[in-house]
């Protein structure tokens, strides 16, 4: 059953996209560690910065202003129902001017904790996934996605925000991590490397994949992203690794074929609606899950990460298009836009399947050391 949308009162004009651009800023966030093609194994024990206490002092998020009295919601699904507003429902968006959060980049200054103190928190993302250390958790049921099949109209905004390519999703895409753990999708974006250099954010046994997709969701318990930031389970990200395969991926081609139009930083285009679920692996039952953070400033913690065991295949040409088309700040290519893996600091990654026995994207010895924290839920 679809979750009903908020209908009464005035449209909520704020809080927006998520992980790559959670505050709806023109440009969000920088990295304290330069992204590396390959993080050394065991890096999870070596934080990139000193571990400062958590992320309590998050920057305030201001609602976006509305244009011409119209609905200009960034990515929030809780929009006014048709009839009340002065115009039809719409997901045409205007970014507000960048503020303190917007001056960051991958590699070099300023250090991310200076951009947002939460970036020095203890429970950050991404992490290295070691399947044999994951706790098998039978309570983790197959993910449920509803409304991810979109007709061609209305079109969706595809934007080069200088840090990634981001597709803003319309309201109505619902995802459940389990009973009572319901979310609405806000946006998706990608992370990649460069020619011959992989660029996924998460790694498996130290292995970095060519690229990674993130679909960012807001818990239905919150009306706006700024309310959810830093709250446990307030945001959830579905992540999948992209690998090279022999055939062109037709779902991804609908986006990749449009990248030339948004080569310049800050540029955007409109693309026909598509089956968003086709961008993800088909097996929704086998995944890893842990609590982490946004992988870009403000690096807010409490984010539930779900990393699919199954990968998505793109052709070599498609992966090349992804890593070699867009431009970022300062006339530099938009490449290697991934954060170094962060220490687990005692966190246990859960698996919805016996990963240590049967092995994940990268096989390991069949050992299961950790027990499922959610057992009996």
């Amino acid at each position: 059953q679809r979750l009903p949308r908020m209908q009464e009162d005035s449209p909520l004009g704020g809080g927006s996209s998520g992980e790559d651009d959670p505050l709806g800023e023109e440009d969000l966030p920088s990295e304290e560690d330069s992204p590396r093609e390959e993080d050394p194994p065991g890096e999870e024990d070596l934080p990139g910065e000193e571990d400062l206490p958590g992320e309590e002092d998050l920057p305030e998020v201001k609602p976006k202003s509305e244009e011409e009295g119209s609905l200009k919601l960034e990515d929030l699904p809780t929009v006014e129902a048709p009839g009340d507003p002065q115009e039809p429902q719409n997901n045409a968006h205007r970014d507000k001017e960048g503020d303190d959060q917007s001056h960051w980049r991958y590699g070099g200054d300023p250090p991310w904790p200076r951009v947002s103190p939460a970036c020095a928190g203890r429970f950050q993302s991404p992490v290295d996934i070691r399947p044999q250390l994951a706790a098998f958790c039978p309570a983790l049921r197959p993910l449920e996605l509803l409304g991810f099949q979109l007709p061609p109209l209305p079109e969706l905004r595809l934007r080069n925000n200088g840090h990634s390519v981001q597709l803003t999703l319309p309201p109505g895409l619902e995802m459940a991590l389990g009973p009572g753990r319901e979310y609405r999708a806000l946006q998706l974006h990608l992370h990649w490397g460069a020619a011959g250099r992989p660029g996924s954010e998460h790694t498996v046994e130290g292995h970095r994949f060519p690229a990674e997709i993130h679909v960012v969701h807001l818990s239905t318990a919150f009306a706006r992203v700024d309310e959810a930031l830093g709250r446990p389970g307030g945001l959830a990200v579905l992540a999948a690794f992209l690998e090279e395969g022999p055939e062109e991926n037709s779902a991804y081609e609908q986006l990749l074929s449009r990248l030339e139009e948004i080569a310049e930083e800050g540029s955007e285009t409109q693309v026909p609606g598509l089956d968003i679920s086709a961008l993800l692996p088909s097996d929704f039952s086998r995944y890893f899950q842990y609590e982490g953070s946004l992988t870009t400033p403000p690096c807010a913690q409490g984010v539930i990460w779900t990393v699919f065991n199954q990968t998505v295949m793109l052709s070599a040409k498609q992966l090349h298009t992804l890593s070699d088309t867009l431009w970022g700040p300062g006339d530099s290519r938009l490449q290697l836009n991934f954060r170094a893996t962060q220490p687990l600091n005692g966190r246990v990654i859960e698996a919805s399947f016996p990963a240590g026995v049967d092995s994940s994207p990268r096989a390991a010895e069949p050992v299961q050391l950790n027990s499922c924290l959610a057992a009996g839920d």
Epitope: S70, L153, P154, E155
Partner: antibody, heavy 118, light 111 residues
């Protein structure tokens, strides 16, 4: 408030042409995809054509493909349907409508009658 | 023949509950596309009644509700009133036809 005011309907002979207009007001026209839907006398609704907000993408029902052309002039806040090679079966009330976020047709024009007859 | 199948007519007495079904296939409703419902009062343009399967635009009474399951959807009207007498249409998108599709319409008579 949102208003869609249609014009251009009338009587035309088979094989003839007609251009329908839909003048929009009360919202940022260029931000919204638009559609044409028709209803033959005593019959149900039939989707005819659709166009994206920028006008860059257009879609047609098989029954009108190659004969009808949807277009828009965002500077004039107006949607058009150019109908060529008209047939008797094109006789209908034509409605313009706006697409909302969910793909529903949220607002409709008042309709304009097109009669194709000799 | 419409891609989405609706009963040609339904009827009910004032205060009663009626449902209107809308049956599609694996390329439209069954593929996961949203279903929307429209009400067309005699001599007027259609009006959006239910969007995205079960959501009511503001101004639409809560007597109207929608649901969707598998390859079909339904519209329920409770506490039937004389002013509900109208034609009702379901609509979705069909990926095989690459077209937006409507049901044939259902005429509701309030007895």
């Amino acid at each position: 408030q949102v208003q869609l005011v249609q014009s251009g309907g009338g009587l035309v002979q088979p094989g003839g042409s007609l251009r329908l207009s839909c003048a929009a007001s009360g919202f940022t026209f260029s931000s919204y995809a638009m559609s044409w839907v028709r209803q033959a006398p005593g019959k149900g609704l039939e989707w005819v054509s659709a166009i994206s907000g920028s006008g860059g993408s257009t879609y047609y029902a098989d029954s009108v493909k190659g004969r009808f052309t949807i277009s828009r002039d965002n500077s004039k806040n107006t949607l058009y349907l150019q109908m060529n090679s008209l047939r008797a079966e094109d006789t209908a009330v034509y409605y313009c409508a706006t697409y909302g976020d969910y793909g529903s047709l949220d607002y409709w024009g008042q309709g304009t009658l097109v009669t194709v007859s000799s | 023949q419409s891609v989405l199948t609706q009963p040609p007519s339904v009827s009910g007495a004032p205060g009663q509950r009626v449902t209107i079904s809308c049956t599609g296939s694996s390329s439209n409703i069954g593929a996961g596309y949203d279903v929307h419902w429209y009400q067309q009062l005699p001599g007027t343009a259609p009006k959006l009644l239910i969007y995205a399967n079960n959501n009511r635009p503001s101004g639409v009474p809560d007597r109207f509700s929608g649901s969707k399951s598998g390859t079909s959807a339904s519209l329920a009207i409770t506490g039937l009133q004389a002013e509900d007498e109208a034609d009702y249409y379901c609509q979705s998108y069909d990926s095989s036809l690459r077209a937006w599709v409507f049901g044939g319409g259902t005429k509701l008579a309030v007895l």
